[in-house]
């Protein structure tokens, strides 16, 4: 009986977690448009978790659509995204793993994990739901996959999806990867501004790291990410004080986000503007 | 082994209310997204609402929004579901399901309870 | 609101091919899930994202969508396929989740 059959798994916590989308148009389905030009194309497959080529009619679609694998992978997975660096080289831990536990000022009640450097572990706290600091993961396993000593210092950062062998369940398959980049400050003040997907058009605003401002953009109404403020103030007073590191093979560099000449900040700039 | 189980169901009064709960087991709750999904007697599957892991969405079915809502409590691995303002109409099988693969809502429901039946009767 | 319309019925001869439809307006641009749920039961995902196979659910079962119809086929139907079978998509416009109305697979 299939019913019996969908008992005999268990997952495990070591599990990792399920996919979090850097931009909710990368969860669209390839779209072909009504037009007939073979062109080819790159998408984000949610399934997979990876950019996949596909043929373009050149006419319509939609905006998971790009013209390179590299930009595929640059705007939709996660390890270019607001995550940590490492080059094959590197295997110190990012900075945020050193940050004590914080609840942040908000009174929300909710189960977090923070790497404790006293016991080189990760370990649960109770998260208000606001504000904060890096070391803040929703999972157990991210944690331990980011600032935990692994094996080789490589952070599991890429994921592929499969379904689990006796259940059915989708369970990510990991595969470890190197990331480049590492963020401090609210990490929802890194992510790029995201419409969502309705078809409003309210006024808002979002953090801007790659110049350090808050500027306005139009929101859908619905979907999106967390760095959206219905005011200016508001956006400033939750995310003005974060700023950028890098870490390159001649050390750290901090860099206050004001200036605008970093490489690390022409990088993102792209994706801020391209998302817009 | 992957379970989750549905309660709280039963006979209840046009008008009144019903709190269903969905105890989750042997995967992270925390890390997933949750529906709940009806059936009426004799008919087809009817999305009621879903919740993201750490319940900062929310998103209901017209049929539903203003009467029901639900939530979640990490720390104990459970889903509900606040039913106010019943109707005869919302007599069905009421299921939980677990999203897999992603927090997205083009990711499928691949966990599901069994169900509890809830009436709405007079 | 896109809508999903499947057959009330569709049936097979034992060892035959089963194609159940489930059609909407420019369906082959969204995701479409497929569940199999027998009577007294929860449902179970048999087809996800179109045409991918859960492990677990056997080769026969296979899916596809394109235009306007998304399609749910089982070769060499067996007698426990004898169920109800729902597609299932995700209208990104009002963040709602759609299912058909369903189709009843009778093995004759």
């Known amino acids: 009986d299939s019913e019996e059959d969908e008992e005999h798994t268990i997952i495990t916590d070591t599990e990792l977690p399920p996919l979090k989308l850097m931009h909710s148009f990368c969860a669209f389905k390839a779209d072909d448009g009504p037009c007939k030009a073979i062109m080819k194309r790159f998408f984000f497959n949610i399934f997979t978790r990876q950019c996949e080529e596909f043929i373009y009619g050149g006419c319509e679609g939609n905006q998971n659509r790009f013209e390179s694998l590299e930009e595929c992978k640059k705007m939709c997975t996660r390890d270019n995204a607001n995550r940590i660096i490492k080059t094959t080289l590197q295997q110190e831990k990012p900075d945020f793993c050193f940050l004590e536990e914080d609840p942040g000022i908000c009174r929300g009640y909710i189960t977090r994990y923070f790497y404790n450097n006293q016991t080189k572990q990760c370990e649960r706290f109770k998260y208000g739901g606001c504000l904060g600091n890096m070391n803040n993961f929703e999972t157990l396993e991210e944690c331990k996959n980011i600032c935990e000593d692994g094996p080789n210092g490589f952070q599991v950062d890429n994921y592929g999806t499969q379904l689990n062998a006796v259940n059915n369940s989708l369970t990510p398959q990991s595969t470890k990867v190197p990331s480049l980049f590492e963020f401090h400050g609210p990490s929802w003040c890194l992510t790029p501004a995201d419409r969502g997907l309705c078809r409003a058009n309210e006024n808002r605003f979002y953090y801007n790291s790659v110049i350090g401002k808050c500027r306005p953009f139009k929101y859908s109404g619905c979907g999106g990410n967390e760095n959206n403020f219905t005011s200016k103030q508001e956006c400033l007073r939750a995310c003005k004080k974060g700023f950028i590191q890098r870490i390159s093979k001649g050390g750290l560099i901090k860099t206050k986000r004001k200036r605008k000449k970093q490489r690390v900040k022409i990088a993102y700039e792209e994706i801020f503007v391209k998302n817009m | 082994q992957v379970q989750l189980v549905e309660s709280g169901g039963g006979l209840v009064q046009p008008g009144g209310s019903l709190r269903l709960s969905c105890a989750a087991s042997?995967?992270?709750?925390?890390?997933?997204?949750m529906s709940w999904v009806r059936q009426a007697p004799g008919k087809g599957l009817e999305w009621v609402s879903n919740i993201s892991s750490n319940s900062s969405n929310t998103y209901y079915a017209d049929s539903v929004k203003g009467r029901f809502t639900i939530s979640r409590d990490n720390s104990k691995n459970t889903l509900y579901l606040q039913m106010n303002s019943l109707r005869a109409e919302d007599t069905a099988v009421y299921y939980c399901a677990r999203k897999g693969g992603g927090e997205h809502g083009f990711f499928p429901s691949d966990i599901w309870g069994q169900g509890t039946l809830v009436t709405v009767s007079s | 609101d896109i809508e999903l319309t499947q057959p009330p019925s569709v049936s097979v001869a034992p060892g035959q091919t089963a194609r159940i439809s489930c059609s909407g307006d420019n369906l082959g641009t969204y995701y479409v899930h497929w569940y199999q749920q027998k009577p007294g039961q929860a449902p179970v995902l048999v087809i996800y994202?179109?045409?991918n196979r859960p492990s677990g659910i056997p080769e026969r079962f296979s899916g596809s969508n394109s235009g306007n119809t998304a399609t749910l086929t089982i070769s060499g139907t067996q007698a426990e396929d004898e169920a109800d079978y729902y597609c299932q998509t995700y209208d990104s416009n009002n963040e709602s989740i759609v299912f058909g109305g369903g189709t009843k697979l009778t093995v004759l």
């Open positions: 042997g995967f992270t709750f925390n890390s997933y997204a």
């Open positions: 994202g179109d045409n």
